[in-house]
């Protein structure tokens, strides 16, 4: 079955049951997510606006899916497996009486079960498991997942252990204003631009002339040197970093545990052994992966490759290619492509190069 292909997952409480105080609902849902984050590498973050991965809804009767609720008793709630749109969403029947205790239906216990489904778990045949299909009140102060629940969720996401530290080769710092300077990877991170080269990265804060050089290992000790591609999904505070056939996920500037993972989990064919460059376009919610003289397009919402790819870079990005070293997205309409010591500002709306620059032009050289 499906799983979330990321470890940083957002949720939003769409509306609140009148049966409980809002703070108690928030607390019950937060604690329910925590039950699962305690035993996996997953991290859950509540957002109040925008599109969350998991939408928590209180509704009665027909409520926009095929599975209308049935009044008091019977079906208490249901949740959809990981995916885009309705995927992951958890619906609670408003005709139940939701509580913080043993009276009525305990929201925390029901939410733990439903979030299990939201994360990809099916029902368990173990009566002690929270994923057993029938509701039974247990003391929430001493509540624990059963061994079967833990086994199930860790088979999908692994355990919460950190990765082992990876060594870095010893490269000397490149000269920033060398006219022949090229970069391995470039990406935005919020209002900053990270330029990767060997075991170093330069940090450029938008509109400020000052830049600083850093060792990759000083910021992210578990990451290797020689990052080959990078992209950011700013709305999720995520940065993906690639080297060889592996990738790492950085959430809120912290490496997620249980990485690296194989690039083939994105859906690349086996002959793809490394990514040259990658860029996410928030307008289309697509990531473009550049490999040799071709590129793939990946739908970040549906978490699958778009059909019809790969395509030739030269055919669809006029004046760019046949291969590129790095690329990043900026100012809502430009890709900046890096090829050796040259850089091309490319307007993706007009579909043409609007400026040719040196790769290190961002540093006032």
């Amino acid at each position: 079955g499906p799983v979330w292909r990321k470890h940083y997952i957002t949720y939003r409480i769409n509306n609140y049951t009148p049966d409980m105080n809002r703070e108690d609902v928030d607390y019950a849902i937060r604690k329910a997510f925590q039950v699962w984050s305690n035993v996996t590498p997953l991290k859950f973050s509540k957002i109040n606006t925008g599109m969350a991965d998991i939408l928590v809804v209180f509704a009665r009767g027909a409520h926009g899916d095929f599975h209308a609720f049935d009044g008091k008793g019977g079906i208490l709630a249901h949740a959809f497996g990981p995916g885009s749109g309705i995927g992951g969403d958890a619906h609670f029947d408003e005709d139940e009486f939701w509580t913080t205790h043993s009276g009525g239906t305990n929201l925390f216990l029901t939410a733990v079960h439903e979030i299990g489904h939201s994360l990809g778990l099916g029902h368990s045949s173990d009566p002690k498991a929270v994923m057993f299909p029938t509701y039974k009140y247990v003391d929430i102060n001493t509540f624990r997942l059963s061994a079967d629940d833990i086994r199930g969720i860790q088979s999908l996401y692994g355990d919460p252990k950190e990765n082992q530290r990876l060594p870095n080769p010893d490269n000397s710092e490149p000269a920033l204003c060398d006219p022949n300077l090229s970069f391995d990877a470039v990406t935005t991170v919020g209002n900053k631009i990270f330029f990767f080269k060997d075991r170093f990265f330069w940090l450029k804060v938008s509109e400020r002339p000052k830049t600083s050089v850093n060792l990759i290992s000083s910021l992210w000790p578990t990451l290797p040197s020689g990052i080959e591609a990078a992209y950011e999904i700013e709305a999720r505070n995520q940065v993906f970093l690639f080297k060889d056939d592996k990738y790492w996920l950085i959430s809120n500037l912290r490496p997620e545990p249980n990485y690296p993972k194989s690039i083939h989990s994105f859906g690349f064919p086996n002959f793809v052994k490394k990514i040259d460059a990658a860029v996410f376009n928030p307008r289309f919610y697509r990531t473009y992966f550049f490999v040799d003289n071709q590129y793939w397009r990946y739908d970040e919402r549906r978490q699958m490759m778009d059909p019809g790819y790969p395509k030739l870079i030269t055919k669809n990005f006029q004046g760019i290619g046949p291969k590129i070293d790095a690329v990043f997205y900026s100012k809502n309409k430009y890709y900046y492509f890096f090829q050796g010591s040259n850089q091309f500002e490319y307007d993706f709306l007009l579909q043409r190069i609007t400026k040719t620059l040196k790769s290190n032009s961002w540093f006032g050289c």
């Epitope: 079955g1 499906p2 769409n14 599109m51 939408l55 809804v57 509704a59 027909a62 409520h63 926009g64 899916d65 095929f66 599975h67 249901h78 949740a79 959809f80 497996g81 995916g83 885009s84 749109g85 309705i86 995927g87 969403d89 489904h117 099916g122 919402r301």
Partner: antibody, heavy 122, light 103 residues
């Protein structure tokens, strides 16, 4: 490439029966919810029926409940619609459509077949 | 049961025009709304899912918005191939369709 190919349509008299099939390829059929949607000549789309990946859960529009039966054979990658007690108002092009993976249906029809025409007339 | 009301039922426009079609649910369906395009003699094609997410391979001139009960499908600059019938849908309920014709 995902492909859905309906067959079994044709002309049938009121009160008669017909069985439609939908052969699926290009995806793991047993992971997905599947549905039938119909369209009467010159009219809009009408959802008819849906079935869960295992076949354990089925759903029907009120207009066909008790007359139509949806089923699937995951070993053959095939979806079926058994239509009994057919009426003139069942005349339509019948499409099979793929939904999402998982325990519940989203009603998100991302791939459709080309349709098969069922005509109920005396 | 939830009802879906789509408007207008037909619409004439020219190539290059910006066109908006609306769909209203009789009660909240959150963002659980999809839009389809259908051309004569063809199967419907998914354009937008979850109210605003563009389906793979669909041109970016198509966009969707809304949540709760009110939703819109917008085509920013009509192309000749966009003249078709458009349907909104949630679960087992389709809107009655909007036929988009050349002016």
């Amino acid at each position: 490439e995902v492909q859905l190919l309906e067959s079994g349509g044709g002309l049938v008299q009121p009160g008669g029966s017909l069985r439609l099939s939908c052969a699926a390829s290009g995806f793991t059929f047993s992971d997905y919810w599947m549905h039938w949607v119909r369209q009467a000549p010159g009219k809009g789309l009408e959802w008819v029926s849906g079935i869960s990946p295992s076949g354990g859960m089925t759903m029907y529009a009120d207009s066909v409940k008790g007359r139509f039966t949806i089923s699937r054979d995951n070993s053959k990658n095939t979806l079926y619609l058994q239509m009994n007690s057919l009426r003139a108002e069942d005349t339509a092009v019948y499409y099979c459509a793929r939904d999402i993976v998982g325990p519940y249906s989203a009603g998100l029809f991302d791939y459709w077949g080309r349709g098969t025409l069922v005509t109920v007339s005396s | 049961d939830i009802q879906m009301t789509q408007s207008p039922s037909s619409l004439s426009a020219s190539v290059g025009d910006r066109v908006t079609i609306t769909c209203r649910a009789s009660q909240s369906i959150y963002t659980y709304l999809n839009w389809y395009q259908q051309k004569p003699g063809k199967a419907p094609k998914l354009l937008i899912y979850a109210a605003s997410s563009l389906q793979s391979g669909v041109p970016s001139r198509f966009s969707g918005s809304g949540s709760g009960t009110d939703f819109t499908l917008t085509i920013s600059s009509l192309q000749p191939e966009d003249f078709a019938t458009y349907y909104c849908q949630q679960a087992g309920i389709f809107g009655q369709g909007t036929k988009l014709e050349i002016k």
